[in-house]
């Protein structure tokens, strides 16, 4: 035997051809390409999917497999018949020719055919196993689908029942809401009536408070006047006693009395025995000119002459040079005592300056300068300060060295701008400097990011406008 070839026919089927001398034996075997390889996701011994396959797909694949099986069975039958027929013919030929080597060829062919048949049978067994596996899976899936359907039906029934319950509950709640609405309308009506009554009451109370405030101011003024009268009377009695004792002339006695009740500052008032805070009349040094000032007799031992106060925004501080010179406002409230008086006073002896500050959050701080004086008007009431202590910043918020005083009509600052016009109020502006206690008064919640407010930079920063400020002076030797 010369050779053994394996090839494909025109329709793609496998064919085995044995050539022996002049004889050629060709065997056509059934095709198995429709049977998927083990790499296919549908083969039983491949890794199975987690989710079940689509039911229709599974049925379709089952039908395909059945068709393949039928094909294979038919091929096998054909093959058996073919082998039997050929065997008969070959046996006759062998008997006729009785050639030894031909028999050997036939035995080989038979062996090949048997091997081929065994292979086909094994493949068919495989396919059967796959089909069985697929069928079992489909049965399981069908069972799962059936269970799922039952479960869904039960859920739908439960939900329907729940919806009915909710509808009943909703109807009940709607009724309740309607009842409540009626009650609410009645309540609102009564609240509105109460509100109107309260408004009337508040208006009355406001009127009473205003009247009381007026009375309080009057009482304060009267109190100060009475204190002064009491002091005058004490002095008069004292003078009379002295006059009787020494038999001095009445004229000298009354002159002494007049000298005694002249106060230069609040320290004088305090030393005279008048230790109640309030408004007192002070006399300019070396002059008969008078001014009214508020004396603080409580803070740090008392004797403080108040030269500035801000507390409620009731007084406009955007004033002229002349107004800042002589002073303005109410000494018991917001006011500026007057640059001329302060200048004359602080040039007589050494004074300390205390600045008391309050923010909108309830915090308080102070700056104390151990030496303070103002130059005369000729030098634009320039401020001079030395020796800072206190809680309102380690650095002075009044620029050092001191600057001239500026007002809206007297621009004495170091800015290309007009600080007094820009920031409002009269102050010892630099360019324009870290402070201005005479700026615009801004109420709470409107007091930030304001560069023309009441500013003390080294305590509250740039744009914070303070709630209250007091500037007061006292002799350094008090």
């Amino acid at each position: 035997y010369s050779n053994f070839r394996k090839s494909m026919d025109s329709v793609g089927r496998k064919q085995y051809q044995v050539q022996h001398g002049s004889c050629s034996y060709t065997f056509l075997l059934p095709e198995t390409d429709n049977c998927r390889s083990s790499s296919s996701p549908y083969v039983s011994n491949a890794v199975q999917r987690d989710a079940p396959l689509d039911y229709d797909d599974s049925v379709h694949r089952l039908q395909v497999l059945e068709s393949i099986m039928e094909n294979n069975t038919q091929w096998l039958m054909k093959l058996e018949n073919y082998i039997q027929d050929n065997m008969k013919k070959e046996m006759v030929e062998i008997q006729q020719n009785a050639v030894q080597n031909q028999t050997a060829v036939m035995i080989e062919i038979g062996t090949n055919l048997l091997n081929q048949t065994a292979e086909q049978t094994r493949k068919l067994t495989d396919v059967e196993a796959q089909v069985l596996n697929q069928t079992t899976r489909l049965e399981l899936q069908l069972l799962e689908h059936s269970l799922s359907t039952n479960k869904l039906e039960k859920q739908i029934l439960d939900q329907t029942s729940e919806i009915n319950k909710l509808q009943d509950k909703n109807s009940f709640l709607e009724k309740k809401v309607l009842d409540m609405e009626d009650k609410h309308i009645v309540q609102l009506q009564s609240i509105k009536e109460e509100k109107d009554q309260l408004q009337v009451l508040v208006s009355k109370q406001n009127s009473i408070i205003e009247e009381l405030e007026r009375q309080l101011v009057t009482a304060t003024v009267n109190n100060s006047a009475l204190q002064k009268q009491q002091h005058d009377l004490t002095e008069t009695v004292h003078s009379l006693l002295t006059m009787i004792a020494t038999s001095s002339s009445a004229k000298n006695s009354f002159a002494a009395k007049e000298e005694q009740i002249t106060f230069r500052d609040c320290a004088d008032v305090f030393r005279s025995g008048l230790t109640t805070s309030g408004i007192y009349t002070l006399t300019f040094p070396n002059s008969t000119e008078e001014t009214k000032a508020y004396c603080d007799m409580e803070t740090g031992g008392g004797g403080w002459t108040t030269i500035q106060r801000r507390e409620d925004g009731s007084v406009d501080f955007q004033r002229t040079w002349k107004e800042y010179k002589v002073g303005f406002g109410n000494p018991s409230g917001e006011h500026w005592l007057g640059n001329e008086f302060v200048s004359q006073l602080t040039n007589q002896q050494r004074y300390v300056l205390k600045i008391h500050l309050r923010d909108w959050e309830g915090n308080e701080a102070y700056s104390l300068y151990e030496h303070f004086y103002l130059s005369s008007e000729e030098f634009n009431y320039r401020i001079h300060l030395k020796g800072l202590t206190g809680t309102a910043g380690k650095i002075s918020s009044i620029s050092q060295p001191g600057n001239d005083f500026s007002t809206k009509d007297a621009d004495n600052d170091k800015c290309i701008c007009k600080c007094s016009q820009m920031l409002t109020g009269g102050w010892w502006f630099d360019a324009c400097g870290p402070s201005n206690l005479n700026g615009m008064y801004y109420p709470q919640r409107q007091n930030t990011n304001k560069f023309n407010g009441i500013k003390w930079y080294y305590w509250k920063g740039s744009g914070y406008s303070l709630k209250a400020t007091t500037m007061m002076i006292r002799p350094a030797d008090f």
Epitope: C415, I416, C417, K418, C419, Q421, M422, L423, D430, A431, C432, G433, P434, N449, F451, N452, Y457, S462, G463
Partner: antibody
Framework: QVQLVESGGGVVQPGRSLRLSCAAS????????MHWVRQAPGKCLEWVAV????????YYVDSVKGRFTISRDNSKNTLYLQMNSLRAEDTAVYYC????????????????WGQGTLVTVS | EIVLTQSPGTLSLSPGERATLSCRAS???????LAWYQQKPGQAPRLLIT???SWATGIPDRFSGSGSGTDFTLTISRLEPEDFAVYYC?????????FGCGTRLEIK
């Protein structure tokens, strides 16, 4: 005499960086907020950024946020503008300017201004 | 942001004449926080007016500012040859600070 002198301008490619400087003299630098203002050729003036006198507060125009950084060295009396990820639209003359009022930072007028430095992004 | 619109874009006048420059804001400028600047070619802007009407130091009184709310005016009573330049308005009432695009004052 109050003076501001800018430097650091030049031609730069898009996406690259540049740092501008502004040397101040003739005034108490630590008391003033400082600004950068720019002017594109033949266009309007545009405020760019401000830094407070202490250097703790900084504000920028939206178009440069995240790309430009304003800073100052009070010991050297110098203001800086670090410009990253530059774009063609950043081409302009950059001026440094002092606030008109000291001890204030943010909303203010400007006086004086520097002579400007040209930045070309191309 | 507040947009400032300046008009006219260009104003052609002769020396000695009166110039009126307008600056209109898209919303009210609180506190009249408006400044005016003069800019000559190749130079930095120079401050003229702050607070809508206050002269900066050293500015001649022929320059005057007025207005409040949304309408502001810069007036030059008698034009001098050195007054021909570009004039800008700037608001510092709300963030961000904004400028107008300028009015060019040229010799007729």
């Amino acid at each position: 005499q109050v003076q501001l002198v800018e430097s650091g301008g030049g031609v730069v490619q898009p996406g690259r960086s540049l740092r501008l400087s502004c040397a101040a003299s003739g005034f108490t630098f630590t008391n003033y907020g400082m600004h950068w203002v720019r002017q594109a050729p033949g266009k309007c003036l545009e405020w760019v950024a401000v830094i407070s006198h202490e250097g703790n507060n900084k504000y920028y125009v939206d178009s440069v946020k995240g790309r430009f950084t304003i800073s100052r060295d009070n010991s050297k009396n110098t203001l800086y503008l670090q410009m990253n990820s530059l774009r063609a639209e950043d081409t302009a003359v950059y001026y440094c300017a002092r606030e008109g009022i000291d001890f204030w930072s943010g909303l203010n007028w400007f006086d004086p201004w520097g002579q400007g430095t040209l930045v070309t992004v191309s | 942001e507040i947009v400032l619109t300046q008009s006219p874009g260009t104003l052609s006048l002769s020396p000695g004449e009166r110039a009126t420059l307008s600056c209109r804001a898209s919303q009210s400028i609180t506190g009249s926080y408006l400044a005016w600047y003069q800019q000559k070619p190749g130079q930095a802007p120079r401050l003229l007016i702050t607070g809508a009407s206050s002269w900066a130091t050293g500015i001649p009184d022929r320059f005057s500012g007025s207005g409040s709310g949304t309408d502001f005016t810069l007036t030059i009573s008698r034009l001098e040859p050195e007054d021909f330049a570009v004039y800008y308005c700037q608001q510092y009432s709300s963030s961000p600070i904004t400028f107008g695009c300028g009015t060019r004052l040229e010799i007729k």
